[in-house]
């Protein structure tokens, strides 16, 4: 079921602030039909952010991801882009999608499908409010706002489009970077039923350096926030599951965020992942100026995780 590439599936109203390329695993350009050109960045936690293609850091990040993808390919990596419908991974999200919401955009275009491979944690992380704020505490202050769980790789607060939870079905994207080990949303599409991202050994929570996937770009994890906060252990648990705008700038200096505005269908969650609140800080996820994303339900179900209250989120304690 290929749809034409004419329709705009993601519209960015706001652009994210800088995100370390180490935290990014893929990027894609939105369609020309969207009018405002933007680069959609996916973090290792599978959070999506809109970025301005004219900014130098975005250009550098894309270049870096392109190099990584090329290196992966040279090394016999398995990064492939897949077009078409991708079945959801069989691996259930470890923690349930909790707050995730299923997004059903109208897929347009030939994006390659992404498969989120989330681990529940990932999902949780993703759930974390925008990336945790900087948990930069050097341990000195015994409290660290838990940066958003790793799942929330940092991202500027308020700019996140939406998180693609690991457990959702694939989304259609074209990725230009290698798939990063661990929960990943982009499909490593090799088969319609993509294997879980982790290698069996990894699943056991152990990984050995030689694996090729290790080369995937890594993404930083803390919230890019400026304040530090404790990392709460079970910090936040959200109950509501409605269509919630995805995070907004979770990263530290991220500018107003871009969120995905979509009609969402709550997904029943197995449990609410305990999330680490976002770090302290003055930022609060903004729910305004959502991004419009439309996707074809048939093509994919993207899980979106709502962004918790900035205050609700507090770091690890």
């Amino acid at each position: 079921q290929h749809h034409g590439v004419t329709k705009c599936n993601i519209t960015c109203s706001k652009m994210t602030s800088k995100i370390p390329v180490a935290l990014l695993i893929h990027y894609q350009q939105n369609q020309a039909s969207c009018g405002k050109r933007a680069i959609i960045l996916e973090t290792r936690q599978h959070r999506l952010f809109c970025a301005d293609p004219k900014e130098q850091w975005v250009k550098d990040a894309m270049q870096h991801l392109d190099r990584q993808a090329a290196a992966l390919t040279r090394n016999g990596g398995t990064f492939e882009k897949q077009i078409g419908e991708v079945k959801p991974r069989t691996t259930p999200a470890a923690g349930g999608m909790d707050e995730s919401v299923v997004l059903e955009p109208e897929a347009t275009g030939e994006s390659s499908s992404l498969e989120p491979t989330p681990s529940s944690q990932e999902a949780q992380r993703a759930l974390g409010t925008s990336p945790e704020l900087p948990t930069g505490v050097t341990g000195s202050s015994g409290t660290r706002l838990p940066p958003t769980p790793k799942a929330q790789d940092g991202g500027p607060v308020g700019t996140e489009l939406f998180r693609v939870p690991p457990v959702s079905t694939a989304a259609t994207w074209q990725s230009s970077a290698p798939h990063q080990p661990g929960p990943s949303l982009w499909a490593e599409a090799k088969t319609s039923e993509a294997p879980s991202t982790q290698d069996p050994s990894t699943q056991a929570s152990t990984a050995s350096s030689p694996a090729p996937e290790e080369n995937a770009p890594s993404e930083g994890q803390r919230v890019w926030g400026q304040g530090q906060s404790p990392r709460p252990e079970n910090s936040l648990e959200r109950e509501e599951m409605g269509p919630v705008p995805a995070h907004t700038d979770a990263f530290q200096d991220w500018g107003p965020g871009s969120m995905a505005h979509v009609s969402v269908v709550p997904v029943s969650s197995e449990g609410t992942p305990s999330r680490e609140p976002v770090a302290s800080g003055s930022w609060t996820p903004k729910a305004e100026e959502p991004i419009h994303a439309t996707m074809d339900p048939q093509r994919l179900g993207v899980l979106i995780t709502p962004v918790p209250d900035a205050q609700a989120a507090t770091r690890r304690q």
Partner: antibody
């Protein structure tokens, strides 16, 4: 309060292996990456790699690939670094550290584990 | 890989002095720079991240600045407890790399 407590000093012979542990407490272990950093005697700091305890996925500095294995045990909130085929230049203090999700800078560190490789 | 070059490698100063340490990256690290302080036999302690954001509990006499490839750590008025070794670290891209360190000694 966040704490990373590492295992004690080790003395090994060349060719042997050593497994250093890092027990985390005070936060949700599976939500934050654990990084490993090497500091040879009188030298600077060198990033070895990270592991995400949530799913066990690792990432390595190419310089340390091949002889280094990073694992995590969610049941005990402990991360491990296994160094195999030890050489004299592996003699160093190894630190585990963790940071926020917005970037991989390290706000909490273990106390360090000294590994001495000597015949 | 991005190389981080720190200078000076050591310096002698007195209490009350203003001290400046620089770190130069081999490529643009977009302000994703952290500074650490390490004392003998101890683990490093985070002072600053994102080029200028002070970590929790760090005295305001420490400040960071810079952009692109050049960054600076400044201690406005050196205190007795500041005599230590300082390292910069870039976290823009992996592998994360550290500067060689600057040892601040008592004059």
């Amino acid at each position: 309060q966040v704490q990373l407590v590492q295992s004690g000093a080790e003395v090994k012979k060349p060719g042997a292996s050593v497994k250093v542990s890092c027990k985390a407490s005070g936060y949700t272990f599976t939500n934050y990456y654990i990084h490993w950093v090497k500091q040879a005697p009188g030298q600077g700091l060198e990033w070895i790699g990270w592991i995400y305890p949530g799913d066990g996925s690792p990432k390595f500095n190419e310089r340390f690939k091949g002889r280094t294995t990073l694992t995590a045990d969610k049941s005990t909130n402990t991360a491990y670094m296994l160094l195999s085929s030890l050489r004299s230049d592996d003699t160093a203090v190894y630190f585990c550290a963790t940071g926020p999700t917005d970037g991989d800078y390290f706000d909490y560190w273990g106390q360090g584990t000294t590994v001495t490789v000597s015949s | 890989d991005i190389q981080m070059t720190q200078s000076p490698s050591s310096l002698s100063a007195s209490v009350g002095d203003r001290v400046t340490i620089t770190c130069r990256a081999s490529g643009n690290i977009h302000n994703f720079l952290a500074w650490y302080q390490q004392k003998p036999g101890k683990a490093p302690k985070l002072l600053i991240y994102n080029e200028k954001t002070l970590a929790d509990g760090v005295p305001s006499r420490f400040s960071g600045s810079g952009s692109g490839t050049d960054y600076t750590l400044t201690i406005s008025s050196l205190q007795p407890e500041d005599f230590a070794t300082y390292f910069c670290q870039q976290f823009w891209s992996t592998p994360y790399t550290f500067g060689g360190g600057t040892k601040v000694e008592i004059k």
